[in-house]
Amino acid sequence: EAHKSEIAHRYNDLGEQHFKGLVLIAFSQYLQKCSYDEHAKLVQEVTDFAKTCVADESAANCDKSLHTLFGDKLCAIPNLRENYGELADCCTKQEPERNECFLQHKDDNPSLPPFERPEAEAMCTSFKENPTTFMGHYLHEVARRHPYFYAPELLYYAEQYNEILTQCCAEADKESCLTPKLDGVKEKALVSSVRQRMKCSSMQKFGERAFKAWAVARLSQTFPNADFAEITKLATDLTKVNKECCHGDLLECADDRAELAKYMCENQATISSKLQTCCDKPLLKKAHCLSEVEHDTMPADLPAIAADFVEDQEVCKNYAEAKDVFLGTFLYEYSRRHPDYSVSLLLRLAKKYEATLEKCCAEANPPACYGTVLAEFQPLVEEPKNLVKTNCDLYEKLGEYGFQNAILVRYTQKAPQVSTPTLVEAARNLGRVGTKCCTLPEDQRLPCVEDYLSAILNRVCLLHEKTPVSEHVTKCCSGSLVERRPCFSALTVDETYVPKEFKAETFTFHSDICTLPEKEKQIKKQTALAELVKHKPKATAEQLKTVMDDFAQFLDTCCKAADKDTCFSTEGPNLVTRCKDALA
C-alpha cells in the first residue's frame, strides 16, 4: 500500500535501532572515505527527521522518496569533490539517475587500511564505555570496505559481535575467549560478503530473470516438498529483497526480508518441515537461520525427470506456450532431485536443456532430436565432480597453505599479467575452499566447492574490470556467471606472456618479516612465489618446490639467528643466486 511518508513507514516498521544501523550502512557503502563521526552525524539528522515525520506525516519534505532524502544528505557533505572527485558530479543529477550514479561509483577495492582488531583489553573498555558507538564503528568499517554487503545480514553479524563481547569481556582471559569467536564471525562475514557480491553482479549484469533462476534452483534444493507455485512465490520475493539491497534501498530490503521470514514461518506446512527451530528465534537470527536452513527430506515418490521433459509428446507445445514457466518447472524439478549439485551446475543444465529445445523444437521431428538430452548432461555433470575430487585430494595431501600455493602457481600461469596482490588474495581465498568444503560429506562437497569458487572468481572479475590486463581473464569474465568457473578451470599457461625480468629486490627480505603474524608471513612468501612464476611461467612444480623450501629454510635460519639483520643481508643474496640457478 502507498504511504504518505516513506521514511516514517520504514522507521515504524524497523524500529529506531535497526533504522539507524541501516542508514549508517547505506551512507558508509556510498561514501566509503568518510569518517565514522561524519556519517554518525548524518545518521542522527536523518533519524531526527524520520521522527518528525512519524509524529506528522504531512510535515515538510516527509513525502519525499528515500533516495531523494538520502541523496540530498550525501550531496550536502562539505568538500565532496576534494574527497571523492567525479562522484560529486552525481549531485548534479536528478533522481533516479543520481542514485544510479552513486551505485556506479561504489568501489569494490577501496584503498583503506585493513580493518585491524584492537587488543582485547582496549576493545572491552571501549565496548563497555559505549556499546552503541562501538557497534556503529563496526558497521561503518565493514560497510565501507564491502559496499555490497547484505545490510540486514550485517546487522546480524553486529549482533553476534555484541553477544561475543558481552560474554568475553566478563571473562578473566578476554583474549582467548574473544579471538577464536571473533575470527569465526569474521570468516563467516567475509564469505557472506563475496556471496552477496555475486548476487548483485548477477542482478546488475544479467537482470532479475538470472537472479530468479538462481533462487528457484537454490530454493528447490532446500525445499523439495514445496510445490512449484510456492517456490516461484519465494523466489520472486527473494529477488525483490536482493534487488533492493543491491540497489542501495536498504530500509526496504530489510523490511521486505523480515516480511519474507514472517511468511515462511507462517507457511511452514507448505514449505518445509525444517523451519521450526529458525522460526523460534528473534528477527535477525531467524532470517539468517532461514537463509542457511538444512535441506528438507526429498519426497520418496518423485517420478523420473524424463517423463515430463523428454518422453512427453507435448514438450515443444508446452515450451511454446510459456517458455519461462516450462524452463522454470524443469529447473525446479531437476533441482529438487539434486541437492548434491551446485546451483551453478543446475543452471548450466537448464541452459543446455533450453538450447536443446530451441534447436530441436524447430526441427520436423523434435522428439527424435531432444530424446538424448539427459545423456548429453553427463559431461556437464562429470566436469565439476572431477574438479572436486582432484582438488580435495590435493588439499588433503598439501594442507591449506600448500593447497593455496598450488592454486597460486596455477592461476599465475593462467593470468600472469594480473597484479601479484590480486593473485595472492584470489589464491588464498580459492585455497580456503579445501578447509571449508573438502571435509564435508560427499553429497555436500560439490555444491559447497563450486558455488564458493564461483563467488571468489566473481571478485577476481570485478577487480580485473577496473584495470583489465589479461585477455584470458577478460574472456572468462565476459561470459555468463555460471560458465565462469569452468572457463577459469580450463585456462592453461598463457603463451602470449613475456616473462618478467628477474629483479633481486623482489626477493630481498629483511628481519622485520620475523615478527609478522603467521598470516602476513604467508602472504610475503606467496608474493615471492607469484613473482617467481611471473619470472619463469614454465617452471616445473619440482623447481618451484625446491626454491620455496630453500626460501622457508632461509627464513627459519635467519629468524633464529642472534644477529638477524646480518643473517638477512649476507644469506639473502646467496638465496637469490641459488633461486636463479634452480630456475635456469
Epitope: 509428446q313 507435448e314 515443444c316 507445445k317 511454446a320 523444437c361 526441427e363 521431428n365 523434435p366
Partner: nanobody, 115 residues
Framework: KVQLVESGGGLVQPGGSLRLSCAAS????????MSWVRQAPGKGLEWVSS????????LYADSVEGRFTISRDNSKNTLYLQMNSLRAEDTAVYYC????????SSQGTLVTVSS
Amino acid sequence: KVQLVESGGGLVQPGGSLRLSCAASGFTFSSFGMSWVRQAPGKGLEWVSSISGSGSDTLYADSVEGRFTISRDNSKNTLYLQMNSLRAEDTAVYYCTIGGSLKQSSQGTLVTVSS
C-alpha cells in the same frame, strides 16, 4: 496464449484436392516445427506430416507420401497442407500441432472424401 485455428476442410470427391490452413498465434511460429495429425471417425489420432521451423525439412506418413505436401509461410504465421488424389480413407478431422505433439488442442477442420 497459444492459438491454432484450422480451416479449408470440406466435402470432396475421391481424386479431388483440398488445401488446409492453420493460423498460429501466441508463440514464435518460425522457431517451432509443426505437424498435421488427423482423427478418422471412431479411430485414434494419426500423425500425417511434419515440417521444420524454417520449412527446409519435411516428413510424411507412408499413407500420404507423394499425395500430400506440407508447407508454411512464416511471415504470415500460417501452416498449410496441400492434399491431392484424396481417398475415402483420408476422411477425418485434421488438426495442426506444435512440435511432435500427438494431442489436438484446437477445433480442427473436417475433411470428408465421398462420392
